[in-house]
Amino acid sequence: ASNFDCCLGYTDRILHPKFIVGFTRQLANEGCDINAIIFHTKKKLSVCANPKQTWVKYIVRLLSKKVKNM
């Protein structure tokens, strides 16, 4: 659901944290239409997720903690 590196919508699937290696924040006020979290998976896929959903917030926190601990 992305075009020119911008997410245009969100995944309707829930990703398990074990498949995700990192994320990028997309901000609506920085050239894209919507706020999004772009998850990067082990299979080198980019998945657009809704930053307001609880599962997304959990994974962002888990990944943020990992980065700080590295």
């Epitope: 829930i14 944290p17 706020n35 307001k52 959903q53 609880t54 599962w55 917030k57 959990y58 994974i59």
Partner: antibody, heavy 125, light 111 residues
Framework: EVQLVQSGAEVKKPGSSVKVSCKAS????????FSWVRQAPGQGLEWMGG????????IYAQKFQGKVTITADTSTSTVYMKLSSLRSGDTAIYYC??????????????????WGRGTLVTVSS | QAVLTQPSSVSGAPGQRVTISCTGS?????????VQWYQQLPGTAPKLLIY???NRPSGVPDRFSGSKSDRSASLAITGLRAEDESDYYC???????????FGGGTKLTVL
């Protein structure tokens, strides 16, 4: 009807640990996020951390990192919160709470609709 | 100190309208994250009053309403009653901390 039943009050010595349980009933356990909230005597609410049982990996507020361990047992629909290296400042009521919508919800994300009655942990020598 | 700022106390006479403010920053309320409001009566667990800025769970009277604008949110209570005397807390998500945060709480006194 959703119910969260917490374990009873505890009196602990400084330096020891305590494990508080929260048994959920009335809905699918796996599909929701559970949080632990602390309230020290006469103070406000503090979000400590939480867990989505399906993920089986907890998250914590920075203040409670290393102090708290949150786990979930899907076989008994129970969430646990362990507090270690107890100090007098850890004396508080500890609440278990569950979000109103599932972990895929956006509008009700973080909205803690169901609460346990709270567990008073007193740390005293 | 709480990430979300609330007045420590507000008061009003029965029948009056009172509002409780909750001021955040660009990493929480200002980042378009939703706000919840809770009521905590003495000696009891908090109760969800408002979720998603302005939605009421079933059973919450329509005397309670929520609103949000820019970096702050408000809880309005109309037709104030003696049983509304309680502590009220706002809550949101903070993207810089990647966790949920509460306001410091507001004690409402019904005169």
């Amino acid at each position: 009807e959703v119910q969260l039943v917490q374990s009873g009050a505890e009196v602990k010595k400084p330096g020891s640990s305590v494990k508080v349980s929260c048994k959920a009933s009335g809905d699918t356990f796996d599909s929701y996020a559970f949080s632990w909230v602390r309230q020290a005597p006469g103070q406000g609410l503090e979000w400590m951390g939480g867990i989505i049982p399906m993920f089986d990996t907890p998250i914590y507020a920075q203040k409670f990192q290393g102090k708290v361990t949150i786990t979930a047992d899907t076989s008994t629909s129970t969430v646990y919160m362990k507090l270690s290296s107890l100090r007098s400042g850890d004396t508080a009521i500890y609440y278990c709470a569950r979000e109103w919508g599932g972990y895929y919800s956006s509008e009700s994300s973080g909205a803690l609709q169901y609460w346990g009655r709270g567990t008073l942990v007193t740390v005293s020598s | 100190q709480a990430v979300l700022t609330q007045p420590s106390s507000v008061s009003g006479a029965p029948g009056q309208r009172v509002t409780i403010s909750c001021t955040g920053s660009r990493s929480n309320i200002g980042a378009d994250y939703d706000v919840q409001w809770y009521q905590q009566l003495p000696g009891t667990a908090p109760k969800l009053l408002i979720y998603g800025n302005n939605n009421r769970p079933s059973g919450v009277p329509d005397r309670f309403s929520g609103s949000k604008s820019d970096r702050s949110a408000s809880l309005a209570i109309t037709g104030l009653r003696a049983e509304d005397e309680s502590d009220y807390y706002c809550q949101s998500y903070d993207s810089s901390l990647s966790v949920w945060v509460f306001g410091g709480g507001t004690k409402l006194t019904v005169l």
